[in-house]
């Protein structure tokens, strides 16, 4: 006869490990007992349990409540045992010794591998700002046994580098993703993907990129000269910019205070019925936490009685 077993038994932390040991013999052969032991390179052989055909299962007190026979129905030639709630310390080599009649003794060894699934964490890097050079966008760390694989899934262009840290019973892997920040990356996902044999599917953690920027400012509203004539209503100047964080807008007049009746509403400057008093240089000041920009325009309100005058538009940042 011979023993049927496995070279390696793999189990996830906290699950039950079935240590297989089945005697495949002639029909008239019997298994008297099966002795299970842990084989430790330092401590030698340590008895785990004894499975007797007549007296049943006897478990070493060190493994009390942790070693059981598989649930019925049981084959009398099956010496397999269950190791409940596997922990990392259980990892190692195990031996079953089978005493049979009349064929004698057989033994087999197997390795128990306990997988420790990782719990990944993603840490965003420092605040990203347009104009920076290569900058850490995020780092992702996962610790497990064996070492997990940490990769990045993103459409954003960058470079990644990984390093691992070996501990007595596990390994931690840290992967960093660096990029050159640009406004086009705003809102783009950067996903850390962790793979491990103890996971049924990859673990994914997504970080949404935020890149601070402030666009150049410009002023719209002077395109139609006919709107800027004495008596006209509804004339407005609109300041155009964009940024992250969203910018705040402030309007001033270069050559004095804003005329009475001129109303500021965010990015828009609204005028009452126009008079020549509204002529002047108006400045839009755009700012966010990153930067500030200015754009100025010269408004000249035309008097229809004086057709020689033209609207002048000067924009400077």
């Amino acid at each position: 006869g011979e023993l049927e077993t496995s070279d390696v038994v793999t189990v996830v932390l906290g699950q039950d490990a079935k240590l297989p040991c089945f005697y495949r013999g002639d029909p008239d052969e019997q298994v008297g007992q099966v002795a299970w032991a842990r084989v430790d390179p330092n401590e030698g052989i340590r008895e785990l349990a004894l499975l007797h055909s007549k007296y049943g299962l006897h478990v070493n007190p060190a493994y009390e409540d942790r070693v059981e026979q598989p649930p019925p129905p049981r084959d009398p030639l099956d010496g397999s045992v269950l190791l409940r709630n596997a922990v990392q310390a259980d990892e190692g080599e195990y031996e079953c010794r089978v005493s049979t009649f009349p064929a004698g003794s057989f033994q087999a060894r197997m390795r128990l591998r306990v997988l420790v699934p990782p719990l990944p964490s993603l840490n965003p890097g420092p605040p990203l700002e347009e104009g920076q050079g290569l900058t850490l966008a995020a780092s992702c760390t996962a610790e497990g046994s064996p070492a997990p694989s940490v990769t990045w899934d993103t459409e954003v262009k960058g470079t990644q580098s990984s390093r691992s840290f070996t501990h007595p019973r596990s390994a931690a892997v840290t992967s960093e993703f660096h990029l050159v920040p640009s406004r086009s990356m705003n809102g783009q996902p950067l996903t850390c993907v962790v793979s491990h044999p103890g996971l049924l599917q990859d673990r994914r953690i997504t970080h949404t990129l935020q890149v601070a920027f402030l666009a150049e400012a410009s002023v719209r509203g002077l395109e139609d000269q006919n709107l800027w004539q004495v008596g006209r209503e509804g004339a407005t100047l609109k300041c155009l910019s964009e940024g992250q964080p969203p910018p705040k807008y402030n309007w001033t007049r270069l050559d004095g205070p804003l005329p009475s009746g001129v109303r500021v509403k965010g990015d828009t400057l609204g005028f009452p019925p126009l008079t020549t008093e509204h002529s002047g240089v108006y400045v839009c000041h755009v700012s966010n936490e990153l930067s500030s920009r200015d754009s100025q325009v010269t408004v000249e309100v035309l008097d229809p009685e004086d057709p020689g005058k033209q609207v002048d538009l000067v924009s400077a940042s």
Partner: antibody, heavy 119, light 108 residues
Amino acid sequence: QVTLKESGTGILQPSQALSLTCSISGFSLNTTGICVSWIRQPLGQGLEWLADICWDDGKGYNPSLKNRLSISKDTSNNQAFLKITRVDTTDTATYYCARNYGGNPFDYWGQGVMVTVSS
Amino acid sequence: TYELIQPPSTSVTLGNTVSLTCVGDDLPRRYAYWYQQKPDQSIVRVIYEDSKRPSGISDRFSGSSSGTTATLTIRDAQAEDEADYYCHSTYSDDKVRVFGGGTKLTVL
């Protein structure tokens, strides 16, 4: 001025262990974001990355050679080391160390050291 | 295993422009780096992050990347540009740093 200089056993026999040293000046192995890599180039062939070691003692190895490689560092002397066990003739190559900084790979290289494995 | 593919050799007439290519599936999402190797000299990085040129590198060298191809362009090629050129990129796999096989540039 950043410089890296490799040194180590020039000639050794198959099955021996190869030990290499990278002596660094112009930057510190303690600086956050600094890593040192080992790269090799067999005669007439291309470059092959072997291993990294970083400021925080994190390490990276080429999976195809991992079980034979060991990388370490001595921050007090600003040196990085590479050990390759059980060498054979295919390990004959010029070995380089190079700096990585802040995610930017291999911005400075050493001159390289020639290693010959011969019986 | 991930590969960066470079033509083994190319040549250029003195004063002309030559483009060296590097093809890899991950290059749309990963920066390319270019290194110059001359006999008995240290390896020098000539382009980083696809298109940036380190200080001290001639402005005759430029880099670009489009899709799965990164390109190193040398204009007004000089005799001193004769060298082996290697591209490099990090692979999406966490464990590998990859070099192309290298292109030997001959200046005629």
